[in-house]
Interface confidence: low
């Protein structure tokens, strides 16, 4: 004969367990039904009656099968530097993530608690490590033969153009100015060039990226101009 199906509430076998989506009620000493996501336990079970579930109210949720006495409050509305990537529903909490140009300086279980603006590398500095959802941009000084003339959170140090005849030598924040009508641009930092008469340095080796600051610390630093080693605008 097939085993008899037990309907909740029922007493578990000694040392046995309740089934999936059931819990053991300590007072009733019975296996009772959990409530599905989007609901909560309005009335706990007894020896003779099962759990009574009710829908979550507006702005509250339960994400799991549960037996909680009230639904959880959805998180507060997303701040101006955030985007709501998941709305608050009866079955899920609101999730806020940082908008473009910002990163999460203080994360929470889902989404972000505090966003901070990505560091901008000032002229003479380029991006050594781009920003991610959870880490800030790392800036580095432009190596000899490279420059950056922008204040940007995305621009890297670019190689100087290579002049046959140089009018103004390039530096870390300015490209070389050529008198020749047809300047050439080196392919990339570290590119090998065929021997040719050039007036500027063509040593374009890529420096080692500077060590990253701990993610989520920059927003705590005092506002003001950054020391040159940081290569940050300080905004």
């Amino acid at each position: 004969l097939p085993a008899q199906v037990a309907f909740t509430p029922y007493a578990p076998e000694p040392g046995g367990t309740c089934r999936l989506r059931e819990y053991y009620d300590q007072t009733a000493q019975m296996c009772c039904s959990k409530c599905p996501p989007g609901q909560h336990a309005k009335v706990f079970c007894t020896k003779t009656s099962d759990t009574v579930c009710d829908s979550c109210e507006d702005s509250t949720y339960t994400q799991l099968w549960n037996w909680v006495p009230e639904c959880l409050s959805c998180g507060s509305r997303c701040s101006s530097d955030q985007v709501e990537t998941q709305a608050c529903t009866r079955e899920q909490n609101r999730i806020c993530t940082c908008r473009p140009g910002w990163y999460c300086a203080l994360s929470k279980q889902e989404g972000c608690r505090l966003c901070a603006q990505l560091r901008k590398c000032r002229p003479g500095f380029g991006v050594a490590r781009p920003g991610t959802e959870t880490s800030d941009v790392v800036c580095k000084p432009c190596a000899p033969g490279t420059f950056s003339n922008t204040t940007s959170s995305t621009d890297i140090c670019r190689p100087h153009q290579i002049c046959h005849v140089v009018a103004i030598p390039g530096n870390a924040s300015m490209d070389a100015v050529c008198t020749s009508t047809s300047p050439t641009r080196s392919m990339a930092p570290g590119a090998v060039h065929l021997p040719q008469p050039v007036s500027t340095r063509s040593q374009h080796t890529q420096p080692t990226p500077a060590p990253s600051t701990a993610p989520g610390t920059s927003f705590l630093l005092p506002v003001g101009p950054s020391p040159p080693a940081e290569g940050s605008t300080g905004d």
Partner: antibody, heavy 123, light 112 residues
Framework: EVQLVESGGGLVQPGGSLRLSCAAS?????????MCWVRQAPGKGLEWVGC?????????YYANWAKGRFTISRDNSKNTLYLQMNSLRAEDTAVYYC??????????????WGQGTLVTVSS | DIQMTQSPSSLSASVGDRVTITCQAS??????LSWYQQKPGKAPKRLIY???TLASGVPSRFSGSGSGTDFTLTISSLQPEDFATYYC??????????????FGGGTKVEIK
Amino acid sequence: EVQLVESGGGLVQPGGSLRLSCAASGFSFTNNYYMCWVRQAPGKGLEWVGCIYPSIVGPTYYANWAKGRFTISRDNSKNTLYLQMNSLRAEDTAVYYCVRDRYDDYGDYFNLWGQGTLVTVSS
Amino acid sequence: DIQMTQSPSSLSASVGDRVTITCQASQSIYNYLSWYQQKPGKAPKRLIYYASTLASGVPSRFSGSGSGTDFTLTISSLQPEDFATYYCQSNSGVNGNRYGNAFGGGTKVEIK
């Protein structure tokens, strides 16, 4: 770093009141977590005081001996848990621990403890 | 409130010994039981939950068993860092919080 830091302990006279605070950091305090208080008298065992449900309005659950004199509350905007203790007695002298618990059945019971704050009730 | 009775209250043992601590609940708590280790001046550390599930980072020499009212914590081979006080605790989840999260009286494991 995920941590709980208690404060507000100290010397208080019998019959007096004291409010303990527990500042939570490194995790989402607002949702998912029951927050509880456990105490330990000098040289004695652990004693459960009570817990509060994740939302601001409760509900709260207390050990029988704590009902009426002790009140647990939380300020989710400050990520802080409180224990208001009234009509204090000498036997309430203990280290009071703030503890994190889960609202669901992930088995994440009492898995994060603060360092404790000492309350001494004496005249 | 549920009462948790732990025994023995203290024991002396040597490194390498097998140690067993028992805990009895005043009513059935199914498998909603945790074990903690506490060292002097420190907060307790959770070792086991759901009666037999080892918490993250806890050495496998610790094990738990039992269901209903009778539970056991076993240390298969006692190590120097295991000399401490051990507590059991009833914790039956949200619904169970209405009936308390009672601790046992503790078992102090000392060096023989």
